[in-house]
């Protein structure tokens, strides 16, 4: 089951997943000047069996013009605010090659991918929070959030983290205390702030299916 909304926003903090549960989707997007190949997928999917998980439907980009555009484009600040994503950073070797059962590691970069990644999480996914540079973490409890299903609705637990404006940078909790959580060890040092903005589906008491929230008309 996909999580209906985004993980909670904490002032002056970002979040990331150390591993992605099977069923997680990642938007296939290309940087400016490139597009998905015609037969390519809209999404990559974390899929697998009892012993191995991997990303299915690899994303592929091709030049959208005759002349290749190789300049890396940084999203405008207002775009970054809307998407709630950060730029991709150079991935390092995963700390632990053996993934959690039922989880995928951070997908490797694909050629000419967009500067940010947007994930669609599933129930049971855990994300970890850290304060942005220039802010220090005050922990009141776990600096993590889990997508849970309650009474047929999905919700994210509230991370117990406050970021204060002192010139120190905190670590991800998993990097401080690897034993704190089964997902505590980072699969990759790729820092991807991930999100899935979503519609709030309107439901009717009498209806068994979700009601349509789209209207179509002539221009």
């Amino acid at each position: 089951e996909l999580c209906d909304d985004d993980p909670p926003e904490i002032p002056h903090a970002t979040f990331k997943a150390m591993a992605y549960k099977e069923g997680t989707m990642l938007n296939c997007e290309c940087k400016r000047g490139f597009r998905r190949i015609k037969s390519g997928s809209l999404y990559m999917l974390c899929t697998g069996n009892s012993s191995h998980s991997s990303w299915d439907n690899q994303c592929q980009c091709t030049s959208s013009a005759t002349r290749n555009t190789t300049k890396q484009v940084t999203p405008q600040p207002e775009e970054q605010k809307e998407r709630k994503t950060t730029e991709m950073q150079s991935p390092m070797q995963p700390v632990d090659q053996a993934s959690l059962p039922g989880h995928c590691r951070e997908p490797p970069p694909w050629e000419n991918e967009a500067t940010e990644r947007i994930y669609h999480f599933v129930v049971g996914q855990m994300v970890y929070y850290q304060c942005v540079q220039g802010y220090r973490a005050l922990h009141r409890g776990p600096a993590e959030s889990v997508c849970k299903m309650t009474h047929g609705k999905t919700r994210w637990t509230q991370p117990q983290l406050i970021c204060t404006g002192e010139m120190e940078t905190s670590q991800f909790p998993g990097e401080e205390k690897p034993q704190a959580s089964p997902e505590g060890r980072p699969e990759s040092e790729t820092s991807c702030l991930v999100t899935t903005t979503d519609f709030q589906i309107q439901t009717e008491m009498a209806a068994t299916m979700e009601t349509s929230i789209f209207t179509t008309e002539y221009q």
Epitope: L2, M25, I118, F199, I201
Partner: antibody, heavy 105, light 107 residues
Framework: PGSSVKVSCKAS????????ISWVRQAPGQGLEWMGG????????NYAQKFQGRVTITADKSTSTAYMELSSLRSEDTAVYYC???????????WGQGTTVTVSS | DVWMTQSPSFLSASVGDRVTITCRAS??????LVWYKQKPGKAPDLLIY???TLQSGVPSRFSGSGSGTDFTLTISSLQPEDFATYYC?????????FGPGTKVEIK
């Protein structure tokens, strides 16, 4: 025949999604036909080969609206055109009510 | 392109009957299969995704199975509101093709 039509699809009840919006058409008495899709947050579209060059799918994040423009219309384009939120592996879970386009001389 | 076929095209059944509709893909699509139900004059409704996972709010009398190229939609006990046309769709690769549909009519 020969003209163009632009159908709009407005999302309400929430923010414009980072999921895809797909366009599907259905000719009278016929089945469903996927035309193409777009992820509004990025604005890049994919099209079925059958419609390549004739269809343009766009999205306006500021108005939470997706558009499908079909050009060089012919009588066989007479159909109901639907937009839907497309979650890929998880299917198209929310659909518009459909817009009937009739091409006649 | 991946081509989808459905059988039967038409099906006459009575309330309470067990109904099975099959869908076949021209090439392997793993479990990237979705089922929809459509009533005349209405937009389709999502029934099942990932070949066998019931969409939220869909009655448990509906079930899906299969993987690779052969898939099945089963209605364990047909209800009056189930008389409709059912479509399968592969979401494995572009274009996301639909099956031609199976119309379930009242006997």
């Amino acid at each position: 025949p020969g003209s163009s039509v632009k159908v709009s699809c407005k999302a309400s009840g929430g923010t414009f999604s980072s999921y895809a919006i797909s366009w599907v058409r259905q000719a009278p008495g016929q089945g469903l036909e996927w035309m193409g899709g777009i992820i509004p947050i990025f604005g890049t579209a994919n099209y079925a080969q059958k419609f390549q060059g004739r269809v343009t799918i766009t999205a306006d994040k500021s108005t939470s609206t997706a558009y499908m423009e079909l050009s060089s219309l012919r009588s066989e384009d007479t159909a109901v055109y639907y937009c839907a939120r497309d979650k890929g592996y998880y299917g198209m879970d929310v659909w518009g009510q459909g817009t009937t386009v009739t091409v006649s001389s | 392109d991946v081509w989808m076929t459905q059988s039967p095209s038409f099906l006459s059944a009575s309330v309470g009957d067990r109904v099975t509709i099959t869908c076949r893909a021209s090439q392997g699509i793993n479990s990237y299969l979705v089922w929809y139900k459509q009533k005349p004059g209405k937009a389709p409704d999502l029934l099942i995704y990932a070949a066998s996972t019931l969409q939220s709010g869909v009655p448990s009398r509906f079930s899906g199975s299969g993987s690779g190229t052969d898939f099945t939609l089963t209605i364990s006990s047909l209800q009056p509101e189930d008389f409709a046309t059912y479509y399968c769709q592969q979401v494995h690769s572009f274009p996301f093709t639909f099956g031609p549909g199976t119309k379930v009519e009242i006997k």
